[in-house]
Interface confidence: low
């Protein structure tokens, strides 16, 4: 079988949800000594970076200006050391936001509930869209989808303190083009005192940790390069 290098890690710096006309930055973290990194969009090559000097940096950044719906979609990256190519990274979905209109988010029975109560969020947007998305701040990768012509429901079932937090919703014009975010709705869940420690569904790391951890090599880093790669995959 054809030998390949371990796959790189692709990340969006700060967030994968980029407001239209703003700049997105994607990072591809590969390996010290990589002489070339390629960014692919929807399966096609779009950009090439060649770090200088290659042995001193373990990844590159790709800057994408002026975000719009044509640039939103699935990105991946690969890298090369000598003549040997890596496997392709996982796919990263880059989303453009602030398209068209702003939805309204409400919660029933209200923003303050007791543990065990059933809660439903409602996201409403009057312009033509059929898909709605609900995100909890700090958990933007956990997107709940719901469908409806003008309004969508997001039933949460019986809530626990793990559901506490601020929520926003978006209308979606396709998988990668979202509306402006709604105003946040803060859900306060009281009770269930013995269960207020971190629940498994809570984020261990906030979104702001989703940054580009590219490092310049020192002697110590060279020894830790393999561990760094393994640790990053474990974190994912």
């Amino acid at each position: 079988p054809k030998q390949t290098l371990p796959k790189p890690i692709i990340r969006a710096e700060s967030t994968y949800m980029v407001p239209k006309e703003k700049q997105a930055t994607l990072c591809c973290q590969g390996s010290y000594g990589a002489v070339e990194y390629q960014l692919h969009f929807e399966g096609s090559l779009f950009a090439v970076e060649r770090p200088k000097p290659p042995e001193r940096i373990n990844g590159v950044k790709f800057h994408i200006p002026d975000m719009n719906s044509r640039k939103a979609g699935r990105y991946s990256c690969i890298y090369r050391v000598g003549e040997l190519w890596s496997e392709r990274s996982d796919l990263l979905d880059l989303v453009v936001t602030e398209m068209y209109d702003t939805p309204t988010l409400s919660v029933h029975p209200g923003p303050e509930v007791t543990s065990g109560e059933k809660v439903t969020f409602y996201c409403r947007l009057d312009t033509a869209t059929s898909m709605f998305l609900l995100l909890k701040e700090g958990r933007s990768r956990d997107v709940q989808r719901s469908y409806g012509k003008v309004q969508a429901e997001f039933p949460m079932g019986p809530v626990t303190t793990a559901h506490r937090g601020s929520y926003r919703c978006f209308g979606s014009y396709n998988n990668y083009a979202w509306s402006f975010p709604s105003e946040p709705v803060k859900l306060l869940v009281t009770g269930d005192i013995e269960n207020t420690s971190l629940a498994p569904t809570d984020p261990t790391f906030p979104d702001s940790w989703d940054t580009c951890l590219l490092t310049r090599e020192t002697g110590l880093q060279k020894d830790l390069a393999l561990w760094d790669h393994t640790a990053q995959n474990l974190l994912r």
Epitope: S44, L45, F62
Partner: antibody, heavy 125, light 107 residues
């Protein structure tokens, strides 16, 4: 809409200097690579050089044929690109275009989605 | 530098014809290739980038294909406004380089 409006061409003697300008509008100028491309009369397109976006440090690259004689600069506050041409030669005679590098310029290359109208530079004694 | 070679250098065709222009790179460039159309006295216009992606606003009769070193621009049904010179350009590495052009003339 995106517009690139060029100025500054003309007739110049061999060894002389000339500065071309390209005024940009309709997009966030500092976010984009900007390039100069030339076309000698009746000939094909030849890349002259580019200046990278602010995110890539605003650094420049030049074709071997102009390196050391031509300088590309940009003023992001004025949304303007410049090409300073010194030690001009007869073979520099061409129509010069400024062009915007498209969205996926990397540190290595670009394609060009918007072009200026071109400005003629004639080097002759 | 990567050399780009276009063929043919010129061709004569009639309205409605299917026209194919080829471009060959001196080394592999993946799918990092763009095509431009230039009419006399005008600036070039981007038609296709990344070998096969149609630039916004370009008619669907234009299509591109290829990867590695060999690329093709096809006009499925030539229209009067398509008589022009076409250039390929690699956007794989610096310096970006252009083919010498293919002039499409009326038969």
């Amino acid at each position: 809409q995106v517009q690139l409006v060029q100025s500054g061409g003309g007739l110049v003697k061999p060894g002389g200097s000339l500065r071309l300008s390209c005024a940009a509008s309709g997009f966030t100028f500092s976010d984009y690579y900007m390039s100069w491309i030339r076309q000698a009369p009746g000939k094909g397109l030849e890349w002259v050089g580019f200046i990278r976006s602010e995110a890539y440090g605003g650094t420049t690259e030049y074709a071997a044929s102009v390196k050391g004689r031509f300088t590309i600069s940009r003023d992001n506050s004025k949304n303007t690109l410049y090409l300073q041409m010194n030690s001009l030669r007869a073979e520099d005679t061409a129509l010069y275009y400024c062009a915007r590098g498209d969205r996926y310029c990397s540190s290595t290359s670009c394609w060009f989605d918007y072009w200026g109208q071109g400005t003629l530079v004639t080097v002759s004694s | 530098d990567i050399q780009m070679t276009q063929s043919p250098s010129s061709l004569s065709a009639s309205v409605g014809d299917r026209v194919t222009i080829t471009c060959r790179a001196s080394q592999g460039i993946s799918n990092a290739l763009a095509w431009y159309q230039q009419k006399p006295g005008k600036a070039p216009k981007l038609l296709i980038y990344a070998a096969s992606r149609l630039e916004s606003g370009v008619p669907s009769r234009f299509s591109g294909s290829g990867s590695g070193t060999d690329f093709t621009l096809t006009i499925s049904s030539l229209q009067p406004e398509d008589f022009a010179t076409y250039y390929c350009q690699q956007h794989y590495s610096t310096p970006p380089t252009f083919g010498q052009g293919t002039k499409v003339e009326i038969k």
